[in-house]
């Protein structure tokens, strides 16, 4: 992770290589312009930080201390002036083309292998979630440490979050919450969910009231995932920051120990960004430390945090892990998920403003059917004859991808994969299978959401003692 000490030059070089590989992966997978530009902006900023620290341009495949011939290769200074989108643009389009094994190597995380999955099964006495079995959550940092603690009856807690940028949530947004709910159930641990309404106010054209109201609306969808009210605290930053001195003290501690150069490198900030943006990463980091929640953990600082998140969030928590020992706290552990594909496949961005880019939690059964049939990118052949002869491609077929996320029955999924790949199952039949999974899933979610009253939301969002037994 980039920081101001000279020893970090190689780390900064490696961060650029990592980000470069991510950019290449996104480009090779035909990700959306917003997503690519966001990643490129971060990369350009990292390169500028490298030049400032090293006194020379970053050179691909030429680490610091390995002098390279003088070069004017690469984009001129004006390259940085091309239009980019901020890193906080929601990045949830398809990961087609991304080699996750390579990302693990580049990011320096660890693969969630069979051994770790078996260990989770032994520790919990529960069958591993299909997100684990199917490699949807595929990478981790320090999960073995969490299991060590758990097996020794030592506590840990879960932390996840949501940037409430609009009232419309789609099925992709449910992935971390579905998995976090499972983790909460099997480990029987407390959970904090951060609603970063302050972040959205800083980045989007919203009033404070709008940002907060989105947080409350989104909280209803999150609550509908079935979280235990006695073990879950959902908080709005705008609300909680002003009432929790423990939380704010940690924010300030983090702010003191992270340089502008570091956040510039990670988040792609420029001199024209408002100071609210620059200090925001500290607010996202603070829930990783248990004494940010004195009503739950009192003043304890030794309780480890486990954060389930998408792999593109990892740089943010690398900063958190970097700062933790410097302020006397344990590093949070991480579980990384793959990206969730847009209906149209890798070439388009899944966005709350495009109703056809995904299945929204507000969609009717008819809308779901129409969207899947009309817009879900198909890996099928051009003609029935060709499809019967050569079979379909499950690797690019969005309906099949969605089934890997939402069809829990492994045997059924494998049968569908075999039938579609062999040509026995046609695209229309595959889409029908997905519709039959999604319609009840969304209908049930909507029914549960209807039952979430303002009083229930208020209780989830009230700082309070949670019921669990920590030694």
């Amino acid at each position: 992770m980039p920081n101001s000490e000279p020893a970090s030059l190689l780390e900064l070089f490696n961060s650029i290589a990592t980000q470069g590989e991510l950019v290449r992966s996104l480009k090779a997978g035909n990700a959306s312009k917003d997503e690519i530009d966001s990643a490129v902006k971060m990369l350009v900023s990292l390169k500028m930080s490298y030049k400032a620290a090293a006194g020379e341009d970053y050179k691909a495949d030429c680490p610091p201390g390995n002098p390279a011939p003088t070069s004017n290769h690469g984009p001129d200074a004006t390259e940085a002036e091309e239009d980019f989108v901020d890193p906080w643009t929601v990045q949830t389009s398809s990961a087609k083309g991304i080699d996750y094994d390579k990302l693990i190597v580049r990011f320096g995380s660890s693969k969630i292998d069979k051994e770790l999955i078996n260990r989770i099964e032994r520790a919990t006495g529960q069958r591993p979630h299909h997100f684990l079995r199917r490699g949807i959550f595929f990478s981790h940092r320090d999960m073995n440490q969490v299991l060590d603690a758990y097996e020794n009856k030592k506590p840990f807690y879960l932390y996840t979050g949501r940037g409430p940028s609009s009232e419309a949530m789609h099925v992709g947004h449910l992935i971390p919450f579905i998995f976090t709910k499972w983790l909460q159930d099997v480990f029987n641990v407390p959970l904090v969910i951060q609603m970063t309404d302050d972040e959205k106010y800083l980045w989007k054209d919203l009033t404070l009231d709008q940002a907060y109201s989105y947080a409350v609306e989104n909280a209803k969808d999150i609550i509908a995932c079935g979280f235990d009210i006695n073990k879950t605290f959902i908080f709005s930053d705008l609300d909680y920051m002003g009432m929790s001195s423990g939380f704010y003290k940690n924010v300030v501690k983090i702010q003191k120990h992270v340089t502008f150069n570091q956040v510039k490198g990670i988040f792609g900030f420029t001199d024209s960004d408002c100071i609210g943006k620059i200090s925001f990463p500290a607010i996202q980091a603070a829930p990783s430390f248990s004494n940010s929640f004195p009503q739950i953990f009192r003043d304890r600082t030794d309780i480890q945090c486990l954060i389930p998140c998408a792999i593109d969030q990892d740089p943010y928590f690398r900063m958190t892990r970097d700062v933790a020992p410097r302020i006397g706290y344990p590093k949070p552990a991480l579980l990384h998920s793959t990206f969730f594909p847009a209906l149209q496949g890798a070439q388009t961005k899944m966005s709350a403003s495009d109703p056809n880019s995904s299945i929204f939690l507000t969609d009717t059964a008819k809308q779901i059917k129409t969207k899947v049939n009309k817009h879900a990118f198909s890996g099928g052949r051009d003609t029935i004859e060709e499809h019967r002869q050569f079979g379909g491609n499950c690797d690019v077929d969005v309906s099949f991808m969605y089934l890997t996320f939402f069809l829990e029955d492994d045997d059924k999924l494998e049968q569908i994969r075999k039938d579609y790949t062999s040509g026995a199952m046609l695209t229309g039949e595959l889409k029908k299978a997905l519709i039959e999974v999604l319609q009840p899933l969304i209908a049930e979610h909507q029914a549960r959401r209807k039952e979430v009253t303002d009083e229930i939301v208020k209780e989830f969002m009230t700082p309070r003692k949670l019921s669990f037994d920590f030694q």
């Epitope: 690519i36 691909a60 390279a68 011939p69 070069s71 984009p75 070439q347």
Partner: antibody
């Protein structure tokens, strides 16, 4: 599906001009650096020119500097190569290629099928 | 004459392992990534290896790339008849501010 389709090739006399186009589809053209690469009959590949995604960085091979101009129109998803003062040694199949590297490194993951340019009197 | 030097030809029998070398200098291979392209007869080139040793999705693991100093090599194991093609290495050259290719190696499967 990613597609690159070159056009504009043909027979031209030495000293003449041609403008090649490369129509891109199936991806967000404005996010990618692009290059022209040529191949003379029976010979190897020769890189000709590259342009960054926004058009602000441009590079040429020494053999075409001052004669060829690369440009792009992101609103039309099209890459161009304006070739002036053509010589017999410019005779080749011209390919446009998409660069997926993040720094114009020549990571050409998709190529067009090529358009033949013949310079002869 | 090409900036990057490749043997003009190579050959092997089915199942064999063949290696194609690519030699450059400190201004190209020495300080930049190497890429390998396969060109089957009558078709456009295809990316085979990127960033020295990485395979794009869809490229069989029989193909592997490596780089050491100012040289790079492409290895093809378990040679098949469909591997018969021209193979090109490529890298950015800092001195020239240009992308350079090797002259190409014609691989024959005997």
């Amino acid at each position: 599906e990613v597609q690159l389709l070159e056009s504009g090739g043909g027979l031209v006399q030495p000293g003449g001009s041609l403008r090649l186009s490369c129509a891109a589809s199936g991806f967000t053209f404005s996010s990618y650096d692009m290059s022209w690469v040529r191949q003379a009959p029976g010979k190897g590949l020769e890189w000709v020119s590259a342009i960054s995604s926004g058009g602000s960085s441009i590079y040429y091979a020494d053999s075409v500097k001052g004669r060829f101009t690369i440009s792009r129109d992101n609103s039309k998803n099209t890459l161009y190569l304006q070739m002036n003062s053509l010589r017999a040694e410019d005779t080749a199949v011209y390919y446009c290629a998409r660069d997926v590297a993040w720094d114009m490194l020549g990571d050409f993951d998709y190529w067009g099928q090529g358009t033949l340019v013949t310079v002869s009197s | 004459q090409s900036v990057l030097t490749q043997p003009p030809s190579a050959s092997g029998t089915p199942g064999q392992r063949v290696t194609i070398s690519c030699t450059g200098s400190s201004s190209n291979i020495g300080s930049n990534y190497v890429y390998w392209y396969q060109q089957l007869p009558g078709t456009a080139p295809k990316l085979l290896i990127y960033a020295n040793s990485h395979r794009p999705s869809g490229v069989p693991d029989r193909f592997s790339g490596s780089k050491s100093g100012t040289s790079a090599s492409l290895a093809i194991s378990g040679l098949r008849s469909e591997d018969e093609a021209d193979y090109y290495c490529g890298a950015w050259d800092d001195s020239l501010s240009a992308y350079v290719f090797g002259g190409g190696t014609k691989l024959t499967v005997l």
